[in-house]
């Protein structure tokens, strides 16, 4: 029958809530790692690849030790929204060129979306301040060439991989303090 009307909802266990978010993050990290390996195998590209529209990496020396849960979740959600947008853009702009990676890219997009929903839920359950809706971002310009798109794919997956590592490390570290 559930709790009587008007009674407060049982407060969630923050460790358990955080834990399930970490698991989704690790799962997405593993998907990203596998896809990065495939991309490097099928479309080798040496050196560091950058894309100006990608978020700057959220961590810096010493920053992990001083993290607070609200700032981690807020920053992670903002960065992952940007990566979701970039993955969607990549699939649209490079559909034919990256056909061999398409099922995996689609799965990555779905799981990224799921993690974003999970973060939103976690923030509301932990009664963290909700962010105002993001202003619409300017559309991403199509890549100038197939090679430009492949370099963009390397930058997007490489950046997402590092961001998810930061997230797993930060969230697990915060979990030890709860």
């Amino acid at each position: 029958p559930g709790p009587p009307p008007g009674s407060p909802r049982a407060s969630p266990d923050p460790r358990a809530e955080l834990d399930s978010t970490v698991l989704l993050t690790r799962s997405l990290l593993e998907d990203t790692r596998q896809l990065t390996i495939q991309l490097k195998d099928k479309f080798p590209a040496d050196g560091d690849h950058n894309l100006d529209s990608l978020p700057t990496l959220a961590m810096s020396a010493g920053a992990l030790g001083a993290l607070q849960l609200p700032s981690v979740l807020t920053r992670l959600r903002a960065d992952l929204l940007s990566y979701l947008r970039h993955v969607q853009w990549l699939r649209r702009a490079m559909g034919s060129s990256l056909k061999t990676l398409e099922p995996e890219l689609g799965t990555l997009q779905t799981r990224l979306d799921r993690l974003l929903r999970r973060l939103q839920l976690l923030m509301s359950r932990l009664a963290l301040p909700q962010l105002p809706p993001d202003p619409p971002a300017p559309p991403l310009a199509p890549p100038s060439s197939t090679w430009g798109g492949i370099r963009a794919a390397h930058a997007i997956l490489g950046g997402l991989h590092l961001t998810l590592d930061w997230a797993v490390r930060g969230l697990l570290l915060l979990k030890t303090r709860l």
């Epitope: 690790r26 799962s27 593993e30 810096s60 992990l64 590092l162 590592d165 490390r169 697990l172 030890t176």
Partner: antibody, heavy 119, light 111 residues
Framework: EVQLVQSGAEVKKPGASVKISCKAS????????MDWVKQAPGQRLEWIGD????????IYNQKFTGRATLTVDKSASTAYMELSSLRSEDTAVYYC????????????WGQGTTVTVSS | DIVLTQSPASLALSPGERATLSCRAS??????????IHWYQQKPGQAPRLLIY???NLASGVPARFSGSGSGTDFTLTISSLEEEDFATYYC?????????FGQGTKLEIK
Amino acid sequence: EVQLVQSGAEVKKPGASVKISCKASGYTFTDYNMDWVKQAPGQRLEWIGDINPHSGGPIYNQKFTGRATLTVDKSASTAYMELSSLRSEDTAVYYCARGELGHWYFDVWGQGTTVTVSS
Amino acid sequence: DIVLTQSPASLALSPGERATLSCRASKSVSTSGYSYIHWYQQKPGQAPRLLIYLASNLASGVPARFSGSGSGTDFTLTISSLEEEDFATYYCQHSRDLPPTFGQGTKLEIK
């Protein structure tokens, strides 16, 4: 060939500090975390902490927080671990190890650096 | 912290025999498709060497006679047919939470 080469053995007095280096070669240094593990005689292996070379962001086992400092020099593909306020229980072999991002399993290890703390 | 207990502490077997090493965690280290347990081999005077990662994946360059299994709290490293070079100490390690911790080791000796 993927390799991690550590600096040589150290003998230190109690209260002193030691800084160990770990030079990586044969792979892209920023694609993996660098972890540090302690092996004291007759004790379990113990994880000290890790650092992401891309950002220089370290995390530590609470047991070593405040005494261990992890740093990297990206241009030299080298990681460092400094341990301060040394005591006799710090006598051990210290290893650097390459860690897969987000997973903490270690697929390449340095040869180890023996640190002896003795008055 | 999660505590890993390995058994037996030591094991004496002959080349050609099958070795079964156990690792038990104080709480589950498995979740949605992954088990965060890894196995290492260490010989005297050498660094540990990764054998198995994420419970059952064979690390690069490791012979197929090594295999890992298990989920939840109970894990096993199996060496199907022992060779001379397999006599060493074996450690399990988890990475389910921070900090990652190691078992106390199982020493595999020649009978």
